[in-house]
């Protein structure tokens, strides 16, 4: 698992609508993998970090001035839909293919 | 300041180009804003925030389970440029007004 | 409350073509697809086919390809199916049901019998 | 076409026991963590009524009596207790795929 040491990477995040109390509204499915950004983003920042100027600025930045400055954050820079059975005001079972913004696709560093 | 304790927020970072060694190709400015994102994610997420549905998912699981998963990160949403001159290949000072994403303009958590 | 009205029964002469309406209310009808079920007496339940009312597109099953049509009228919130060149095979109940894009059948009509004899 | 089959055709069960009904379909019903599956209540003259969709969640104003279960190709129905009103006929249905499809049918009669 990516711990504090480990570099910035994407890793498993089963998350339960039950635990969340998003199941009074979505009915299906039960859990879903949202997965999670786990990890440092340490000097150098490598390329699969897709680090921006900024970040990069902020790493050097940091380098130099520990306690002053903060390190990038690794954080979902780009997301994936799920699909969730949900009900309507109507109280009709309705499909949603594409709930956006659900799971991480990407991590990086911000 | 923010703090650990504070709200994530935009905050001030003066950056010197001497500090993190780019001052050998920039010639100016000596030194800019880059602005740093500092501060906390925590619950409820508030709108200014603009939370990615993840983002709110994750903050409502480390609630569950805080040792288990962090909290969303506090990190630049939107960046600007700077203009900046600098030293080309052949050392002809050459002004680049646009210097993409060296400066934050929104924070959120991510 | 949501109501899907249809007629009691029709009769039809062999060969002859019915067409069956179901009028819906108490929610907006182009919201939901509008699906038709055939039921012979005392056997099972057949999908027929299924219709958006919001732009008229339409799923069949294949067996009822060329026995049914499926159409709505918006401004009066009805749905019909029209069914052609009847034998003693299409004696049967026939509903129309309303549900999501997820395909469960939440409201029904009563039904209507269509009786084929000479 | 996803078939349906269902068992038992029928079955008698007493008052106040549970009444299970099984359901297998040819391929598995789920999708996107989501099992579609249904299922419906018929009595003599009257449409089916909505009973369970999802597999296991109760549509609106059926009692708790009623229970669904199951996932991929198989699938039951539980009625526990069992109420002299639950007599009637009980159809598992597939949303997965068009054409939808129906199984068989169980006939339930109280002893």
């Known amino acids: 698992s990516a711990g504090a040491g480990s570099h910035c990477q994407k890793t498993s995040l089963r998350v339960n609508f039950e635990d969340i109390g998003w199941d009074s509204w979505i009915i299906a499915p039960k859990e879903y993998e949202a997965y999670e950004c786990k990890g440092g983003c340490f000097f150098p920042l490598a390329d699969d970090v897709t680090p921006t100027k900024h970040a990069i600025v902020q790493t050097l930045v940091h380098l130099k001035f520990p306690t002053k400055v903060g390190k990038a954050c690794c954080v979902p820079t780009k997301l994936s839909p799920i699909s969730v059975l949900y009900k309507d005001d109507m109280g009709v079972p309705t499909l949603k293919y594409h709930y956006e913004g659900m799971s991480v696709a990407e991590c990086g560093c911000r | 300041s923010a703090g650990a304790g504070s709200h994530c927020q935009k905050t001030s970072l003066r950056v010197n180009f001497e500090d993190i060694g780019w001052d050998s190709w920039i010639i100016a400015p000596k030194e800019y804003e880059a602005y740093e994102c500092k501060g906390g994610c925590f619950f409820p997420l508030a709108d200014d925030v603009t939370p990615t549905k993840h983002a709110i998912v994750q903050t409502l699981v480390h609630l569950k389970f805080p040792t288990k998963v962090g909290k969303a990160c506090c990190v630049p949403t939107k960046l600007s440029p700077i203009s900046v001159l600098y030293k080309d290949d052949m050392g002809v000072p050459t002004l680049k007004y646009h210097y993409e994403g060296m400066s934050v303009a929104e924070c959120g958590c991510r | 409350q949501v109501q899907l009205q249809q007629p009691g029964a029709e009769a039809v002469k062999p060969g002859a073509s019915v067409k069956l309406s179901c009028k819906a209310s108490?929610?907006?009808?182009?919201?939901?697809?509008m699906h038709w079920v055939k039921q012979r007496p005392g056997q099972g339940l057949e999908w027929i086919g299924e219709?958006?009312?919001?732009?008229?597109?339409?799923n069949y099953n294949e067996k009822f390809k060329s026995k049914a049509t499926l159409t709505v009228d918006k401004s009066s919130s009805t749905a019909y199916m029209q069914l052609s060149s009847l034998t003693s095979e299409d004696f049967a109940v026939y509903y129309c049901?309303?549900?999501?894009?997820?395909?469960?059948?939440?409201?029904w009509g009563q039904g209507t019998l269509v009786t084929v004899s000479a | 076409d996803i078939v349906l089959t269902q068992s038992p055709a029928s079955l008698a069960v007493s008052l106040g026991q549970r009444a299970t009904i099984s359901c297998r379909a040819s391929?598995?019903?789920?999708?996107?963590?989501?099992?579609?599956m249904n299922w419906f209540q018929q009595k003599p003259g009257q449409p089916p009524k909505f009973l369970i969709y999802?597999?296991?969640n109760q549509g609106s104003g059926v009692p708790a009596r009623f229970s669904g279960s199951g996932s991929g190709t198989d699938f039951s129905l539980n009625i526990h207790p069992l109420e002299e009103d639950d007599t009637a006929m009980y159809f598992c249905?597939?949303?997965?795929?068009?054409?939808?499809?129906f199984g068989g049918g169980t006939k339930l009669e109280i002893k």
């Open positions: 049901t309303m549900g999501s894009n997820y395909g469960g059948f939440v409201y």
């Open positions: 108490g929610y907006t009808f182009t919201r939901y697809w």
């Open positions: 219709i958006n009312p919001s732009n008229g597109g339409t």
């Open positions: 391929e598995s019903l789920d999708n996107y963590g989501i099992s579609f």
């Open positions: 999802a597999a296991s």
């Open positions: 249905q597939q949303s997965k795929e068009v054409p939808r499809t």
